[in-house]
């Protein structure tokens, strides 16, 4: 008769492991007894159980309640095992060691490998602004046995860096994402991808980036200026700029207040029917925690009387 | 024949020591684990103490330990028991018995067992 | 240590009768279960092994069930050499215990 078992059996963290150890005797043969041992380098027998065809199944008080036979229909030749809820302690060497009438002894080793699934973390870098050099976007950390595979999924363009540390069960892996932050990259995905034989898929976190910026400034509504005469109704003036934290506005008047009437609403300012008072140096002011940006524009209204009287002159003059 | 045969026992003074000794025959005595048990006048068995075939690992009962010394001789098929520091509740019928080594410190049912021998502790 | 629980302590029976002891552990011992049978001035002698099995020599009116943690000794026809004190034992453990013992007297 031979045994049969397995090199290396793999389970996750807190599965139960099967430990198989099959006697494939000739007809007539009986096993009297399976012992089970974690047998590492270094290190005695422990014992684990003792399977006996008469007495039962014998579980060492150190692994009491954890250590069960396969329920039944049992084969009297099987001398498997099942230890319930597999921690990473129980990594390592096992042996089976059967005792046969009348072949004798034979005895069998596998090894027991249990995978501790990694919890990965992300950790966001310090605040990205626009014109840094090259700057930690995010770190990602994952620990497991064996050690994960941690990488980076994204469309940003950037550079990545890896470091290890092993521990005596396990090893932490933690790789940087690092980029030159530009206003482009604003609401992007980064995506830590961490693989690891005990997860059934990958693990994805995602972390969407904000970089700091803020634009020029500028005024559109004077495009043109011919639609600035007294009387006109609806003028308005509106600040265009944009940035990450979305900027306040703020209008002045550079030659002095504002004139009565004249609505601030946020970007936009917004004038009553125009009168020659309205004609200014008019300033947007625009800012968020990043910076701040100026532009002003010339108001002139024209009066549509001037402009006739002129036209009439010219005409009569003629 | 399978044969255990107990001796040593008397009596002695509280505080005392004795030597009790099973001369085993009829068997490998060195591939059995053997044991010792008592039994007080009229009450149950108790186990003493026991120790392993091949080497010196033995155990004992909380009641003995550290006042009784298990010990074998496998080329005189000889098992000891020293007892010292004896008190009046180590009086007793002292057996010794033989149980096979299944794996570890696991063993079989004690098959066999000596006629006993009589310790008795007073003053 | 794992505590071994017989009932009754002691029982009277007449030849012919069925006697049943039962022994009962604090914790699961599989079938590492021995009964004993001692007559007074004797050493105990095994008569049941394994929870269940008869050992060599010991007439089959004699036999034995239970797993885990009950357990029972049968006679299946009390005979007048059977009066005697009957002890369960487990070996699961170190250090291995006995019941406190049944009495069969004579009714």
């Known amino acids: 008769g031979e045994l049969e078992t397995s090199d290396v059996v793999t389970v996750v963290l807190g599965q139960d492991a099967k430990l198989p150890c099959f006697y494939r005797g000739d007809s007539g043969e009986q096993v009297g007894q399976v012992a089970w041992a974690r047998v590492d380098a270094g290190e005695g027998a422990q014992e684990l159980a003792l399977l006996h065809s008469k007495y039962g199944l014998h579980v060492s008080p150190a692994y009491e309640g954890r250590v069960e036979q396969p329920p039944p229909p049992r084969n009297p030749l099987d001398g498997s095992v099942l230890l319930r809820n597999a921690v990473q302690a129980d990594e390592g060497e096992y042996e089976c060691r059967v005792s046969t009438f009348p072949a004798g002894s034979f005895q069998a080793r596998l090894r027991l490998r249990v995978l501790v699934p990694p919890l990965p973390s992300l950790n966001p870098g310090p605040a990205l602004e626009e014109g840094q050099g090259l700057t930690l976007a995010a770190s990602c950390t994952a620990e497991g046995s064996p050690a994960p595979s941690v990488t980076w999924d994204t469309e940003v363009k950037g550079t990545t860096s890896s470091r290890s540390f092993k521990h005596s069960r396990s090893a932490a892996v933690t790789s940087e994402f690092h980029l030159v932050p530009s206003r482009s990259m604003n609401g992007q995905p980064l995506t830590c991808v961490v693989s690891h034989p005990g997860l059934l898929q990958d693990q994805r976190i995602t972390h969407i980036l904000h970089v700091s910026f803020l634009a020029e400034a500028s005024v559109r509504g004077l495009e043109d200026q011919n639609l600035w005469h007294i009387g006109r109704e609806g003028a308005m003036l509106k600040c265009l700029s944009e940035g990450q934290p979305p900027p306040s506005y703020n209008w002045t008047r550079l030659d002095g207040p504002l004139p009565s009437g004249v609505r601030v609403d946020g970007d936009t300012l917004g004038f009553p029917p125009l009168t020659t008072e309205h004609s200014g140096i008019y300033v947007c002011h625009v800012s968020n925690e990043f910076s701040s940006r100026d532009s002003q524009v010339t108001v002139d209204v024209l009066d549509p009387q001037e402009d006739s009287g002129k036209q009439v002159d010219l005409v009569s003059a003629s | 024949e399978v044969q255990l045969v107990e001796s040593g026992g008397g009596l002695v003074q509280p505080g005392g020591s004795l030597r009790l000794s099973c001369a085993a025959s009829?068997?490998?005595?060195?591939?059995?684990?053997m044991s010792w048990v008592r039994q007080a006048p009229g009450k149950g068995l108790e186990w003493v103490s026991g120790?392993?075939?091949?080497?010196?690992?033995?155990h004992y009962a909380d009641s003995v330990k550290g006042r009784f010394t298990i010990s074998r001789d496998n080329s005189k098929n000889t098992l000891y028991l020293q007892m010292n520091s004896l008190r009046a509740e180590d009086t007793a019928v002292y057996y010794c018995?033989?149980?096979?080594?299944?794996?570890?410190?696991?063993?079989?049912?004690?098959?066999?067992w000596g006629q006993g021998t009589l310790v008795t502790v007073s003053s | 240590d794992i505590q071994m629980t017989q009932s009754p302590s002691s029982l009277s029976a007449s030849v012919g009768d069925r006697v049943t002891i039962t022994c009962r552990a604090s914790?699961?011992?599989?079938?590492?279960l021995a009964w004993y049978q001692q007559k007074p001035g004797k050493a105990p002698k095994l008569l049941i092994y394994a929870a269940s099995s008869l050992q060599s020599g010991v007439p089959s009116r004699f036999s034995g069930s239970g797993s885990g943690t009950d357990f029972t000794l049968t006679i299946s026809s009390l005979q007048p050499e059977d009066f005697a004190t009957y002890y369960c034992q487990q070996h699961y453990t170190t250090p291995p215990t006995f019941g406190q013992g049944t009495k069969v007297e004579i009714k």
């Open positions: 009829g068997f490998n005595f060195y591939n059995y684990g």
């Open positions: 018995a033989r149980a096979e080594l299944l794996a570890f410190d696991v063993y079989t049912a004690s098959d066999y």
């Open positions: 914790q699961g011992i599989s079938s590492y």
């Open positions: 120790i392993k075939p091949h080497s010196d690992v033995a």
